[in-house]
Interface confidence: low
């Protein structure tokens, strides 16, 4: 929506004659009729599709026109339009002589025309006036014109509606091209989103007005980056809300129970090692020769049963001595003297003699390990599954459970992202390392070729009554060139009455 403005400045008719050459009596009382229409290569009669306007009598013969209201008429003359400005136009300006006060076309003599000019061309929207002068053999007209947008309309064609606002629905003013310009402290497509206090945590904080930082439940602090621990948490902290992770030495649901009894009370005697094991609970690990809850009782050396594998203990003045049963030796009878004859290999392991029978080694079957084949092998310890697959033990074998997008025994194969034909409108799919890419055919764009990029505004045949459709010069809109007898932006209205002015 906009206005074509025409400012008449000076009209010269020194001899005071009509177009026919006949003089006006007593002088040429001059008024103007203006017709604005769609672009025509050769301006021809027909409906003024963009509008018409006429003036009262502005002067006699030669005169200057004041640039304000004059005798009830307006200067500049206003020709409003409520469609997208097409960028081209045709303009007809006629000067007429009014013998009397009735300026209606039917009240004037047929030869009352003083002069007529017709121009056409391109005209961009803008504040600057185009100054022009048109001279004929007997007259000269100086005038200027421009196209400006109506209030709240912007852009090269006055097609963008934008109304500044500062309320719940948006906080913005309008730029010259009609795009929104957010007021300070606001962002988003319609400037509805406040810009929070600088540093306000993205997930844990929010704001309802600029420079604010309101915390979501479970968070606190100026920037909402400190979690709130469980209510009543005494000696603990949190890394996520409502946790109570106890400081060292404290326990219980609220970290209010003292667990560091060892440090505070030193209950273990005779050089024993103290271990905390709960609230007011501890364990003393006694040195050899001591026993009791706090290792407060002295033992004989053999009271601690130091001899292993069934060895018997003998107290001695300087300690103790172990008498080992057959097949064992060492200070505590801890070493075996078994051989392959004693069948030491478990789970079907094969025994091999070493050092002339003084020792042996077990060769284990699959899935077992250890010096006596006593341990079951975990086949997943080597992390055989690629691309984040999960390893599962399945009896004598293992298997990999793959993440989405991968397959194969060890999840080593990448499933093709193109297999599901994700590219729309005949786009070509290319597998990439981290996803896919679509190559779009002409007329489409977007990550999946889902966006139609070129539109022929005339393709939908918007013009009625056999009118000719032209695509606009600068936007994907249309202009209808109406045949004689029809008007309107789509040539949809028949002219029921004779036209107001005989163009």
């Amino acid at each position: 929506s906009g206005v074509f403005q025409l400012q008449l400045q000076e009209f010269i008719n020194e001899r005071g004659v009509l177009a026919s050459g006949r003089p006006c009596e007593p002088g040429c009382r001059t008024f103007f009729r203006v017709c604005l229409k769609h672009f025509q290569a050769v301006v021809s009669p027909g409906p003024c599709t963009f509008g018409t306007v006429s003036t009262p009598v502005l002067g006699t013969n030669s005169f200057a026109v004041r640039d304000d209201s004059s005798g009830g008429g307006r200067n500049p003359l206003q020709l409003p339009f409520n469609f997208t400005w097409p960028g081209t136009f045709s303009l007809i300006i006629e000067a007429w002589h009014a013998p009397g006060d009735d300026l209606r076309p039917e009240a004037l003599p047929p030869d009352a025309l003083i002069s007529k000019i017709a121009i056409q061309g391109s005209l961009a929207v803008g504040q600057n006036w185009l100054l022009d002068e048109q001279t004929s053999t007997l007259t000269r007209l100086r005038y200027s014109y421009r196209v400006i947008c109506s209030d709240n309309y912007y852009g090269d064609n006055c097609s963008r509606l934008c109304k500044k606002r500062n309320d719940h629905f948006g906080h913005y003013v309008c730029q010259p091209d009609g795009n929104l310009s957010c007021l300070p402290g606001w962002t988003g497509e319609y400037c509805q989103q406040p810009i929070c206090l600088s540093g306000c945590h993205e997930q844990n904080g929010y704001c309802s007005k600029p420079a604010e930082c309101l915390c979501r439940p479970g968070w606190q602090g100026r920037l909402c980056n400190e979690c709130i621990p469980h209510n009543g948490c005494r000696h603990g902290t949190c890394s996520t809300p409502w946790q109570c992770t106890c400081d060292e030495g404290w326990g219980g649901l609220f970290c209010d129970q003292d667990l560091n009894y060892c440090t505070h009370h030193s209950p273990c005697k005779n050089g024993a090692t103290c271990s905390n094991s709960g609230q007011r609970s501890y364990t003393c690990t006694c040195r050899p020769g001591y026993t009791g809850v706090d290792c407060e009782l002295e033992l004989s050396e053999c009271d601690s049963n130091p001899c292993r594998n069934g060895g018997s203990c003998k107290d001695q003045e300087d300690g103790y001595h172990c008498l080992c049963p057959p097949g064992y030796y060492g200070l505590h009878c801890e070493h075996s003297t078994l051989s392959c004859a004693d069948s030491p290999c478990f789970n079907g392991g094969s025994c091999r003699e070493r050092n002339q029978g003084a020792n042996y080694a077990c060769e284990c079957p699959p899935n077992f390990t250890g010096s006596n084949c006593e341990k079951k092998v975990d086949r997943c310890t080597s992390n055989p599954c690629a691309n984040g697959g999960q390893c599962l033990n399945r009896g004598p074998s293992r298997m990999c459970r793959c993440r989405p997008g991968f397959t194969g025994t060890y999840c080593e194969l990448h499933v093709s992202d193109c297999a599901r034909n994700p590219c729309a409108h005949g786009g070509t799919c290319h597998d990439l390392e981290n996803g896919l890419m679509c190559t779009c055919p002409a007329g489409f764009s977007g990550r999946r070729c889902e966006v139609r990029t070129s539109i022929d505004a005339c393709a939908s045949s918007p013009c009625f009554n056999r009118a000719t459709c032209y695509t606009d010069l600068s936007t994907d809109t249309f202009v209808c060139n109406c045949p004689y007898g029809f008007v309107g932006s789509r040539c949809e209205f028949p002219v029921g009455l004779p036209p107001s002015f005989p163009w």
Epitope: I119, G121, S122, A124, L130, L131, D132, E133, Q134, L473
Partner: nanobody
Framework: EVQLVESGGGLVQAGGSLRLSCAAA????????MGWYRQAPGKQRELVAH???????YYADSVKGRFTISRDNAKNTMYLQMNSLKPEDTAVYYC??????????WGQGTQVTVSS
Amino acid sequence: EVQLVESGGGLVQAGGSLRLSCAAAGSTFSSYVMGWYRQAPGKQRELVAHISTRGITYYADSVKGRFTISRDNAKNTMYLQMNSLKPEDTAVYYCNTRRNFLSNYWGQGTQVTVSS
């Protein structure tokens, strides 16, 4: 006063191409709206294409997609690239310019003949 000189016309077979040039003598070429018109024998002169001071282009339906109008303000020259020529494109092609769309200036014309 503005002088316009067209060149580049000639005889070409249907489906061929030609490039017309229009050189303008005048220091304010960039502020002129430029256009190409043509007149076939026994017919009215018709608009082919025009280009605004900002480079906005307009084409007659009969040449859309085949002809391309352009201007080089540094060389004070306007061009018309004509592809996929048809016998019905045969005409005298005129270069036209307007200062503020009122003062009309025309070149002398260049003949384009398309044989079938």
